[in-house]
């Protein structure tokens, strides 16, 4: 699996789990929430060269498209596969509210 | 939807359904297919700028965190979402075969 | 610059619903929390609740529990307000609000121009 | 929820005259060494305008002789010469509790 136990151990150019803090106040410009202050996102990008983790028949018809033409612009893309939500605290006016925010962690990536 | 109806209409430079024509033989190297001799298989391609059919939170904080920092390289990335079988015909010697190949067609985009 | 541009007035009848709309541009629409304000003829100003369009968290005005529903369209940068089960006494001006941006529950800076909502039989 | 008072309801005034407007809240508003409270001016037919927040900071383009001030429960809104557009509707508002309430507004008229 392309995950921070594969890809945070190994120096990988193509399609791979790549390490992102968000900082709320400073990266998305939200300053409302009270914790946690920012997360590790993390990110997917890379190379989907042929048969590199590929997620569906299309994406292998895709790198195998591309094998063949290599100058076509026609080519899977890297992203992300299991995501996990974060809990996020913050206040309406004195009153704590504690949150689920769903998908907001990238924990394995995909040729798609 | 990002799919035919709308960017094949539509000259459009963000993620948009593509349209990529597949011949078996020239483009795959498959030469056991019968029918078809080839499908359209198009494909997802095109920028993926802040809410543009955003798939997932995470996308979302991606979409945005590009737009607050353009530098970053972490972005989201048009990829399919609606994948569609094909039925092709081949021979086991002179007995033919029909069989539906899964996820071949792509119907729609997304930025994930 | 900010801009808040709401949908234009309503004629209702009691036990309908209406859904306002409130289309934002010059800023990005993820960020911000968006309240809605009503005013009663001659009367003063009643919160009845916000939504985060990002993740579609809302806090509702318990006054207006079950009969109101927040929800946006980030593709087109719109919130909209929906309000079931009218009575005369809903008969107001409709206003969407952005929020300042520090807190969840917070003044509001940029308001939209207002929707006249008459419910009468 | 917070019930928030003001007055006068409605007071007279000259153009160059000072006024003050009061909000009392039926609790303290004050947390985190903030004071949430806030003021906005309406005209008729428009909607209303954010002129103080947190009490005493004055909303970007508001001119300096609108001023607030207060703590805990008691707060005021102070015009420091009173100009003829000046003539509104003013309200406050606490969001130091759910739900954000106002106060019933105080009407300035020309004398």
């Known amino acids: 699996a392309l995950d921070a136990a594969y890809c945070f151990r190994n120096v990988q150019d193509n399609c791979c789990l790549r390490p992102l803090y968000i900082d709320f106040k400073r990266d998305l410009g939200w300053k409302w929430i009270h914790e946690p202050k920012g997360y590790n996102a993390n990110f997917c990008a890379g190379a989907c060269p042929y048969l590199w983790s590929s997620d569906t028949q299309h994406s292998r018809v895709l790198s195998l498209y591309n094998t063949i033409n290599p100058e076509a612009s026609a080519s899977p893309c890297c992203v992300s596969q299991d995501l996990e939500p974060l809990t996020i605290l913050y206040y309406i006016g004195k009153t704590p509210k504690i949150e689920q925010l769903s998908n907001m962690i990238v924990k394995s990536c995909k040729c798609s | 939807a990002l799919d035919a109806a709308y960017c094949f209409r539509n000259v459009q430079d963000n993620c948009c359904l593509r349209p990529l024509y597949i011949d078996f033989k020239r483009d795959l190297g498959w030469k056991w297919i019968h029918e078809p001799k080839g499908y359209n298989a198009n494909f997802c391609a095109g920028a993926c700028p802040y809410l543009w059919s955003s798939d997932t939170q995470h996308s979302r904080v991606l979409s945005l965190y590009n737009t607050i920092n353009p530098e970053a390289s972490a972005s989201p990335c048009c990829v399919s979402q609606d994948l569609e079988p094909l039925t092709i015909l081949y021979y086991i010697g002179k007995t033919p075969k029909i069989e539906q190949l899964s996820n071949m067609i792509v119907k729609s985009c997304k930025c994930s | 610059q900010v801009q808040l541009v709401q949908s234009g007035a309503e004629v209702k009848k009691p036990g309908a619903s209406v859904k306002v709309s409130c289309k934002a541009s010059?800023?990005?629409?993820?960020?911000?929390?968006m309240n809605w304000v009503r005013q009663a003829p001659g009367q003063g100003l009643e919160w009845m609740g916000q939504?985060?369009?990002?993740?579609?968290?809302?806090n509702y005005n318990e006054m207006f529990e079950g009969r109101v529903t927040m929800t946006t369209d980030t593709s087109t940068s719109t919130a909209y307000m929906e309000l079931r089960s009218l009575r005369s006494d809903d008969t107001a001006v409709y206003y969407c609000?952005?929020?300042?941006?520090?807190?969840?529950?917070?003044?509001?800076?940029?308001w939209g121009q207002g929707t006249l909502v008459t419910v009468s039989s | 929820d917070i019930q928030m008072t003001q007055s006068p309801s409605s007071l007279s005034a000259s153009v160059g005259d000072r006024v003050t407007i009061t909000c009392r809240a039926s609790?303290?508003?004050?947390?985190?060494?903030?004071?949430?409270m806030h003021w906005y001016q309406q005209k008729p037919g428009k909607a209303p305008k954010l002129l103080i927040y947190?009490?005493?900071n004055l909303e970007s383009g508001v001119p300096s002789r609108f001023s607030g001030s207060g703590s805990g429960t008691d707060f005021t809104l102070t015009i420091s010469s009173l100009q003829p557009e000046d003539f509104a509707t003013y309200y406050c508002?606490?969001?130091?509790?759910?739900?954000?309430?106002f106060g019933g507004g105080t009407k300035v008229e020309i004398k």
């Open positions: 609000a952005r929020g300042i941006g520090n807190y969840a529950l917070d003044a509001m800076d940029y």
């Open positions: 010059g800023y990005t629409f993820t960020s911000y929390w």
């Open positions: 939504i985060f369009p990002f993740s579609g968290s809302t």
């Open positions: 609790e303290s508003v004050d947390f985190w060494g903030n004071s949430f």
């Open positions: 947190l009490a005493s």
């Open positions: 508002q606490q969001n130091a509790e759910d739900p954000l309430t």
